[in-house]
Every structure is written in structure tokens, then in C-alpha cells.
């Protein structure tokens, strides 16, 4: 029925999304400017909207010619399919006066058997199938071609490839008479990149490989595939990067043991176990060396396959990531928090940081939170004074005519920045939390007297009295 | 026009048996995942059973489990549910749903079928 | 299982004022950008009718004065101005997961 959200089927299926690239439309300029700069010192965010606003002032009327949307592709390799068998794609906005080139992969979950991909067709079918996926996507975000929204990137050509194979990017199996359905989310991304090479992809100077939640840890699982396939096609110069953000998981123990029946239940170790064998899923060579037959399931958590990696890897991950408390069967419901929880995501967070310490270009902030990168409100968070965008370009700038991250961080341009403040939302640039049961916004002194912290306890180390701490805490300072 | 039509019901013996059924039409039903929703006289809505879309898994309540079975053809556009074991808590409007695949939740309502446990 | 906890029970509405019921989750029904909880209507001797999907999306043919919102675990129904024919039973009911459940129901009445 009408009124629904534009990816849901309309009754009537609409005609194939176009397999080819559409011809400049009359009357549009087919030469663009492009205004590529790697790095700018100063205040970036102003500086950007001025060459912004000049840029599009030497096209008349150019304010009807600025289309956010990027456009659908479906795959012109049909056999490369989504889970029910329907073609793979991806979204573009090129632009073409750019040698940057980022390319996004989508999360949602997984399923790991035939039940809970069952179910998972049956309410959530466009993360299984590009059958009702809309014509066009709007970039948000670090895919915004917005410099007040993107301030890091918003000039590069942008690529959204949607999540369809619900196996963490991994798969390479095909849909049979024996599988039900198909997990080819690795071959998916090899095949996007085959395809835009078509489209100017191969002019290319960087590629960022960047992903949420599952597109995050497939950012992990596929960046150095993506540069080997690029070296064999004849590409060696094209530098391949990546960007995880909430894919740095934990093998952890659950704070409450539970049985692996659903997605959301399962720990972490059992559901990527069951999972690997049932997508027949594909992790990075190297690091497959490193562990026997069988326990290649290692590979999907972070800490473990990016000592492996060759490409540089920007790691963004809240400390207490949401969804890594789901999978640890913690659900912060109304009630305060017993000691035990409370001590059980204290812990949780110090172990996350831990794995990050040799990880020298990484982000990671005090909150409880889950994604980032494509929010339109990215670029206010901080940590230690410096913004995501900001530590992206210094990354940028870190790695400026090498593949490797140089050892001595450039002064004043951080890359290394991870929240060492103890407790959830302790940083004040978190994004704002709502109690969970009234949906009413609470500030940080509300919300971490609701985890259960006494404020004697926390303001101790700090060298405060607890009503200094609170009357801090409430200003945002 | 999208239509769900349940029968079957009627009065029953403890410990009886009887099969419901529900037949659709004016949509592809091999497309959408099935559910039985039941309503005891003056209650509130209870979720009973799930088929996929394909057939292929079933899932129910922990109040059913055991004494129910859920299936379909799809070949005939009808859902099944068969049940053995009757109590009188069972007795219930028993209504068929359709589940949109794009969030699960129930677009399409039968008018329901009334089943009786009694002695 | 996710419960749902559906507030008040009943509630009396004068005509053209607002009504608001509210459901609680027993954890988070949202994922990937969309929260899986959806509102029904059901009258005497009917089957429930949907009023809005995905916490939020009015369903074709559903006047406007319905409204849904909320996220993780609290989600609350809308009826502003109240009229007559709302006079019904409201129930909440997600599908993030199986088994799937509804909340107990609330009963309006406009005075």
C-alpha cells in the first residue's frame, strides 16, 4: 500500500533500475572543476563552504543542479546475487573531477541458519534482496557531498553498496539445490570494484573501503582482498584503505549466558562459529594461516585479523557499543543497574580499549552508541578536542605518499584517539542518551546516576567533590 | 483485492482435535511469512505461530508447543494449523495474518474462525 | 522473550483532546535504523486493523490524527483531536525478533 517508506514494494513491481550509465542530461555541463585538496590547514569546515559556495557559483542555476542522490546500479554479472538470488548493486554519485573514491558497506545483522534467515526474509527482505530497493539514495554523512556534513570527504566519488548477503560480507557461495540462498557478500564487493573501474574508478588515486556495524567488520575482512584484486587487474597504484566503524567486536564472555536460538541472543564466538560454516564465509589469507582448520571464525574479530591486514585501517568503535551489548545479553531496561552489571560494562569498555592501544590510527569515544560515520551529525563528537573528520584527515595526511602509517605523528594532527575516562558517557560529546523506557533525554549526571554510579566513586579520581562533578557534568564541560 | 479467510473452527472436546485453514487470495502468497494470532472471549491479542514465507520454518508459542503444527501450501494459497490436545484455553477467535516483509508487521487481517474446548 | 508493557489499561477522553498510550519493551527493538514495533485498532467483533508501522509510518488510509513515535524500548500512540469512532482497543505488537508478542491492550473511551 502507498505511504510506506520508499524502499517497500509498491503492489506493482516498478521497471529494472538502469544498467548504464545515464548520458548528461541537456543543458548540463559535462567538464567539471574539480576542487580535490588533501590537506587544509585552518578552520576546514569554513573553508570548504567558501570554495563550496564558489564552486557552485560558476555554474548558472547550479542550485537545481545539485543532486545529492546517488543512483542505483544493479550488477551486470547477475550470478552475483543477494541471498534470494536477485542481482547484487550498488549506489554511485560520481564525481569526476575527483581521484578519491570511497566505497561504503552497509551493516544490519547477519543470520547464521536456515530458521533465523527464514525470518529474516520475512520482515526484513531488503537487507536479502534488491527486488524493492529504491532508484535513489541520499548520501549522509561521510557520502554527503555537503562540506558542512563532510567536511573530510564530501568531494570524493561516492559508492553505497547496500548489505544483502547477511553474512558479514564474507560469502562466496551461491544459491543451489543444496543452499536455499546465496552468501556472496565478499564477491559482491570484488564485483562492485570490477564494475567501476568501467566508471572512472580507474583513475583512481584512493580508494576507502569504510563500513558500519557488519560493514564495518567486512571492511576488516575484505580491505586487502580488494588491493589484491585491484594489483591483478593491473591497478597497483590505486592506494586501498579502509574504514571500520562499529566492527571491532569482542570474543568476550555474555554477562548472562544464553542459548544461541536468535541473532540477537547468540554470543558473539557461537553465532560467527555457526556462521562461517553456513555462509561457507571467506576471511583474510594471512590471517587464516594463523589459525588452524576450523577456527577461522577467529578472523571476524577485529584485535585478532588487524595485525594480519597490509592495508592501513582507521578504526572508529564507542567503547560501549550497543551492539556489542546486545550480544552480551546486557539490555539496559528502566531500572537502575546492579553492581555487577555496572562493573561487567566498565570492564567491557577498558578491554575494548586495551586492543585498541597498537592500533595507531583509531577513534574511540567514551559512549554508549552504535555507528557513526554515516549520521549526519558525525562530525560533533570528539575526543581529546579533535573530531572524526579532523582525525580522518590527519590520517590523510599521515599516510600522504606512503602506504603505511609513518611512526611519528604529525603535530597538532592526532590519529591515535581513544576516551580513557572510565565510564559510559563520560565524554560530554557524546551523543545525547534517552532513558530507554520514557524516551526523555537525560543528560550525563542523570544518566550515569541510572547506570548505577556513585558519584562519590567517580568523582574521587577525578580530584572532585561529587557536587563539582555534577554541576561539570550538567554544563557539558 | 487482498483477502485471508479462516475456517474450521467450532465446538471441540477436551483433548479433541480439529484443523483450521486459511485461504488467501489477490496476492502472490509464496511472497509473505504467515501467522495465527488468537483471542480468548474478553482478552487481549496472543501471537500463536509463524510459517515462512517458503514453507520451510515454523515457529509457536511456548503455550502451543507440542500440540500444534503449522503448514501451507502454496500451490493452494492456504495456510494450515492443526491442533490436538484441546484445552479450554484454547478457545479462542483464531485469526490468520499476513506478515509485510519489510517489518513483519501484520497488513492483512482474516475476519477469524471460532473455536469452542468444551465439555 | 520480549514483553511488552502496554500503559494504562483504559482511559476516557473528551472529544477533540489527545490520547496517549505508551508501550515499553522489556529490551531494545530497534536495529539497523528501524524500531519493530507496530500499533493495531480493534473494535467489538473485528479483527485488529493496522494503524502505524515501524513506530512511526502511517499506514495508507489511516486519518492523520494517529501518530506513532519512539525508539529502543518506549514507543508511544498519538490520537489528536480524538474523535467518536476511535472509541476501540489499541494494541502494540513488535517483530524484531521470534516469538513475536503484543501488549496487553488499551481500552479508550471518549467521555
Known amino acids: 500500500s502507498e505511504g510506506r517508506k520508499t524502499w517497500r514494494r509498491r503492489g506493482q513491481q516498478p521497471p529494472p533500475p538502469p544498467r548504464t550509465e545515464a548520458a548528461p542530461a541537456a543543458g548540463q555541463p559535462v567538464e567539471s572543476f574539480p576542487l580535490d585538496f588533501t590537506a587544509v590547514e585552518g578552520n576546514m569546515d569554513s573553508f570548504m563552504a567558501q570554495v563550496k559556495s564558489l564552486a557552485q557559483s560558476l555554474y548558472p542555476c547550479s542550485a537545481q543542479q545539485l543532486n545529492e542522490d546517488l543512483r542505483l546500479h544493479l550488477l551486470l554479472n547477475t550470478s552475483v546475487t543477494c541471498n534470494d538470488g536477485s542481482p547484487a548493486g550498488y549506489y554511485l554519485k560520481e564525481s569526476r573531477g575527483s581521484r578519491r573514491w570511497l566505497l561504503f558497506l552497509e551493516g544490519g545483522w547477519y543470520c547464521f541458519n536456515r530458521e533465523n534467515c527464514d525470518s529474516r526474509y520475512d520482515t526484513m527482505r531488503r537487507l536479502m534482496s534488491s527486488r524493492d530497493w529504491p532508484r535513489t539514495r541520499t548520501g549522509t554523512g561521510i557520502l554527503s557531498s555537503q562540506p558542512e556534513e563532510n567536511p573530510y570527504w564530501w568531494n570524493a566519488n561516492m559508492v553505497f553498496i547496500p548489505y544483502c548477503s547477511s553474512d558479514v560480507w564474507s560469502g562466496a557461495s551461491p544459491k543451489s539445490d543444496k543452499n536455499e540462498y546465496a552468501f556472496m557478500g565478499s564477491l559482491i564487493i570484488q564485483e562492485v570494484v570490477r564494475e567501476l573501474l568501467g566508471k572512472g574508478l580507474s583513475g583512481a588515486k584512493v580508494l576507502l573501503l569504510a563500513g558500519s556495524s557488519a560493514g564495518g567488520t567486512g571492511v576488516l575482512l575484505n580491505v586487502d582482498r580488494v588491493a589484491e584484486l585491484l594489483e591483478e587487474l593491473g591497478y597497483p597504484s590505486i592506494q586501498v584503505r579502509g574504514l571500520a566503524d562499529s566492527g571491532w567486536f569482542l570474543d568476550n564472555k555474555q554477562y548472562r549466558r544464553s542459548d544461541c536460538i536468535d541473532t540477537i541472543n547468540c554470543a558473539p564466538t557461537d553465532a560467527i562459529r555457526r556462521g562461517i560454516r553456513y555462509w561457507s564465509g571467506m576471511v583474510p589469507e594471512r590471517c587464516q594461516r594463523q589459525f588452524k582448520e576450523g577456527e577461522e571464525w577467529n578472523c571476524f574479530f577485529g584485535y585478532k585479523v588487524y595485525p594480519t591486514l597490509r592495508c592501513p585501517v582507521f578504526v572508529v568503535q564507542w567503547l560501549f557499543d550497543e551492539a556489542q551489548l546486545t550480544v552480551d545479553n546486557v539490555h539496559l531496561t528502566g531500572q537502575p543497574v546492579q553492581e555487577g552489571l555496572r562493573l561487567y560494562i566498565q570492564n567491557l569498555g577498558r578491554e575494548l580499549r586495551h586492543t585498541l592501544k597498537d592500533v595507531p590510527a583509531s577513534f574511540a569515544p567514551a559512549c554508549l552508541s552504535h555507528e557513526i560515520i554515516i549520521r549526519s551529525h558525525w562530525t560533533d563528537v570528539q575526543v581529546k578536542g579533535t573530531s572524526l573528520p579532523r582525525a580522518l584527515h590527519c590520517w590523510d595526511r599521515s599516510l600522504h605518499d606512503s602506504h603505511k602509517a609513518s611512526k611519528t605523528p604529525l603535530k597538532g594532527c592526532p590519529v591515535h584517539l581513544v576516551d580513557s575516562c572510565p565510564w559510559p558517557h563520560c565524554n560530554p560529546s557524546c551523543p545525547t542518551v534517552r532513558d530507554q523506557f520514557t524516551g526523555q533525554e537525560m543528560n550525563v549526571a542523570q544518566f550515569l546516576m541510572h547506570m548505577g554510579f556513585d558519584m562519590q566513586t567517580v568523582a574521587q579520581p577525578q580530584g572532585l567533590e561529587p557536587s563539582e562533578l555534577l554541576g561539570m557534568l550538567s554544563n557539558g564541560s | 483485492d487482498v483477502q485471508l479467510l479462516e475456517s474450521g473452527g467450532g465446538l471441540v472436546q477436551p483433548g479433541g482435535s480439529r484443523k483450521l485453514s486459511c485461504a488467501a487470495s489477490g496476492f502472490t502468497f509464496s511472497d509473505f511469512g504467515m501467522h495465527w494470532v488468537r483471542q480468548a472471549p474478553e482478552k487481549g491479542l496472543e501471537w500463536v505461530a509463524y510459517?515462512?514465507?517458503?514453507?520451510?520454518?515454523?515457529y509457536y508459542a511456548d503455550t502451543v508447543k507440542g500440540r500444534l503444527t503449522l503448514s501451507r501450501d502454496n500451490s493452494k494459497n492456504t495456510l494450515f494449523l492443526e491442533m490436538t490436545s484441546l484445552r479450554s484455553e484454547d478457545t479462542a477467535m483464531y485469526y490468520c495474518?499476513?506478515?509485510?516483509?519489510?517489518?513483519?508487521?501484520?497488513?492483512?487481517w482474516g475476519q477469524g474462525t471460532s473455536l469452542t474446548v468444551s465439555s | 522473550d520480549i514483553v511488552l508493557t502496554q500503559s494504562p489499561a483504559s482511559l476516557a477522553v473528551s472529544l477533540g483532546q489527545r490520547a496517549t498510550i505508551s508501550c515499553r519493551a522489556s529490551k531494545s527493538v530497534s536495529t539497523s535504523g528501524y524500531s519493530y514495533i507496530h500499533w493495531y485498532q480493534q473494535k467489538p467483533g473485528q479483527p485488529p486493523k493496522l494503524l502505524i508501522y515501524?513506530?512511526?509510518d502511517l499506514e495508507s488510509g489511516v486519518p492523520a490524527r494517529f501518530s506513532g513515535s519512539g525508539s529502543g524500548a518506549a514507543f508511544t500512540l498519538n490520537i489528536h483531536p480524538v474523535e467518536e469512532e476511535d472509541a476501540a482497543t489499541y494494541y502494540c505488537?513488535?517483530?524484531?525478533?521470534?516469538?513475536?508478542?503484543f501488549g496487553s491492550g488499551t481500552k479508550l473511551e471518549i467521555k
Open positions: 505488537h513488535h517483530s524484531r525478533e521470534l516469538p513475536f508478542t
Open positions: 495474518a499476513r506478515a509485510s516483509y519489510d517489518g513483519g508487521y501484520f497488513d492483512c
Open positions: 510459517s515462512s514465507s517458503g514453507g520451510t520454518t515454523v
Open positions: 515501524l513506530a512511526s
